[in-house]
């Protein structure tokens, strides 16, 4: 029997390598059965996840899954870091794994490095 718990499909240790100045959509895939839960995004600051208020968010519906999207328009160097989405469901909080944005400031990079280079070259990243 299929579980009717809310599930948030962000992979553990996932990351996105992106560039300052570009638009970017960070998606939180949400599986639910009857009522769509309230979902929020937060940004990790050490062990605390600070709720992101007043940001542009939207929902996208696909066949078996909904996506709660955090929009970066555009990406700023200060957007570098780890993010988590949370769902409020039956008075319980379900938290996703965190996903990390590695932001490269194109002004400081002579050419755009590959995704793997960026993930392994922390001196390109902003904290």
């Amino acid at each position: 029997k299929e579980s009717c718990d809310v599930q948030l499909y962000i992979k553990r240790q996932s990351y996105h390598s992106i560039f300052a100045g570009d638009p970017f959509k960070l998606e939180c895939p949400v599986k639910y059965c009857a009522h769509r839960p309230q979902v929020t995004w937060c940004k990790l600051n050490g062990t605390t996840c600070v709720k992101l208020e007043g940001r542009h968010t939207s929902w996208k519906q696909e066949k078996n899954l909904s996506f709660f999207i955090l929009h970066f328009e555009p990406v700023l160097p200060s957007d570098n870091g780890s993010y988590r989405c949370s769902a409020n469901f039956l008075s319980a909080i379900i938290e996703s794994h965190s996903t990390t944005l590695y932001v490269t400031d194109v002004k400081s990079a002579s050419e755009r490095p590959s995704k793997d280079e960026m993930a392994s070259r922390p001196w390109l990243l902003y904290s």
Epitope: L8, K11, S14, Y15, H97, S98
Partner: antibody, heavy 119, light 112 residues
């Protein structure tokens, strides 16, 4: 039925390259991380690296960085390991493993493929 | 890199025995989500490894309940409560909390 089937092993000359395939079925490869692990005869397991088939992001053990390339084609539900500049000490059984990325709900291993590096 | 040290390296035991294998990591395997990503694998000669336990203590589907895992931080244990003939194999711990992921050197469980 869940399956991971490696292929592409065999005899390779020192200095040569190999490309191994890992064909998966019974689950959506995009929901997983694909790992490549090797085992020399009579020895333990050695982690080579990991690929996220959903976006291509890859991590490698330091000793394989620059020599190994792990990739996946989610349309074929297949992952790949390319290893260059082969040495005799790369002789081993190479395994792919698929671990569910969200809730750790499964961790499947292929049967392995033997690579022999010899002149 | 995190070193994973298993003990003992080999072990002779009889059917029905209770067996304990330990795995010590050189640093904590506690991730920032509060979980330790420690797996136990079983490998029989000429066969692929098979995951038995994940997240320290969760049993994979179809794994007999005589297998159990415990521990936290840096010290972890695999226990087989009553050895069966099919349990004679090599067991590996594997951490996937920190990159690069690392394995213990293995514990070979043999029939006494």
């Amino acid at each position: 039925e869940v399956q991971l089937v490696e292929s592409g092993g065999g005899l390779v000359q020192p200095g040569g390259s190999l490309k191994l395939s890992c064909a998966t079925s019974g689950f959506n490869i995009k929901d997983t991380y694909i790992h490549w692990v090797r085992q020399a005869s009579g020895k333990g397991l050695e982690w080579i690296g990991r690929n996220d088939p959903a976006n291509g992001n890859t991590k490698y053990a330091a000793s394989f960085k620059g020599r190994a390339t792990i990739s996946a084609d989610d349309s074929k539900n297949t992952a790949y390991l390319q290893l260059n500049s082969l040495k005799t000490e790369d002789t081993a059984v190479y395994y792919c493993a698929s671990y569910e990325g969200y809730y750790e709900r499964f961790g499947y291993w292929g049967q392995g493929t033997l690579v022999t590096v010899s002149s | 890199d995190i070193q994973m040290t298993q003990s003992p390296s080999s072990l002779s035991a009889s059917v029905g025995d209770r067996v304990t294998i330990t795995c010590r990591s050189s640093q904590s395997l506690l991730d920032r989500d509060g979980k330790s990503y420690l797996n136990w694998l079983q490998q029989k000669p000429g066969k692929a490894p098979k995951r038995l336990i994940y997240l320290v203590s969760k049993l994979d589907s179809g794994v007999p309940s005589r297998f159990s895992g415990s521990g936290s931080g840096t010290d972890f244990t695999l226990t087989i409560s009553s050895l069966q003939p099919e349990d004679f194999a090599t067991y590996y711990c594997w951490q996937d909390t920190h990159f690069p992921y690392t394995f213990g050197q293995g514990t070979k469980l043999e029939i006494k």
